[in-house]
Amino acid sequence: YDFTNCDFEKIKAAYLSTISKDLITYMSGTKSTEFNNTVSCSNRPHCLTEIQSLTFNPTAGCASLAKEMFAMKTKAALAIWCPGYSETQINATQAMKKRRKRKVTTNKCLEQVSQLQGLWRRFNRPLLKQQ
């Protein structure tokens, strides 16, 4: 899927009004300096690809974030403001329904959400030069 045709300003507004708050809620109790993030993305479509990757897929040490509030709102925002995105998610939604697991917040998941916060911040500042 190509995120080039998304309405980036609407997605940014959704992030600022609600998704960012849900990410902060998830991270509550952790210090902002606790995770040393080196995440990167080069432009808005690339940032959304990385956000898609880390929000809806298991990674080393963190089995699932897809059922978290910020993830569901991210999926809704992409479905509404990225033409054709919903069609890519049919298999994924069915697979998620099959395996609803007990929520366990591990340190690795906190680290991953911290990475997501960095990617979202980068998405919101597309004209800044990448460090």
Epitope: S40, T49, S53, F56, N57, A92
Partner: nanobody, 117 residues
Framework: QLQLVESGGGLVQPGGSLRLSCAAS????????MGWYRQAPGKQRELVVT???????NYVDSVKGRFTISRDNTMNTAYLQMNSLKPDDTAVYYC???????????SGKGTLVTVSS
């Protein structure tokens, strides 16, 4: 169906290094999170490292600082550089690719890494 072929495994002494490679058949390699699972004798398979399409990485604590995952999207290949290897790292290492949109996983047949003196 995505085909994955691992190479680079072998016998190495404690403290030594190995570099595993994973070649993928898919032309659209850039829609996959790539990762490496390992399975030691009598233990469950564990996902030890992952890399997103854009190169953002995650490691389990037991390999952090010793293992480095990288990818070359033009060559459809992922790499795992393993340094300061320990006997505990002995396992079959499986390359894994996950389509970031469809919750579909593909794995290779595995390559054996043995760390022993």
């Amino acid at each position: 169906q995505l085909q994955l072929v691992e190479s680079g495994g072998g016998l190495v002494q404690p403290g030594g290094s190995l570099r595993l490679s994973c070649a993928a058949s898919e032309s659209d390699f850039s829609i996959y999170i790539m990762g490496w699972y390992r399975q030691a004798p009598g233990k469950q398979r564990e996902l030890v490292v992952t890399i997103t399409p854009g190169g953002n990485t995650n490691y389990v604590d037991s390999v952090k600082g010793r293992f480095t995952i990288s990818r070359d999207n033009t060559m459809n290949t992922a790499y795992l550089q393993m340094n300061s290897l320990k006997p505990d790292d002995t396992a079959v290492y499986y390359c894994n690719a996950r389509n970031i949109f469809r919750n579909v996983d593909y794995s290779g047949k595995g390559t054996l890494v043995t760390v022993s003196s």
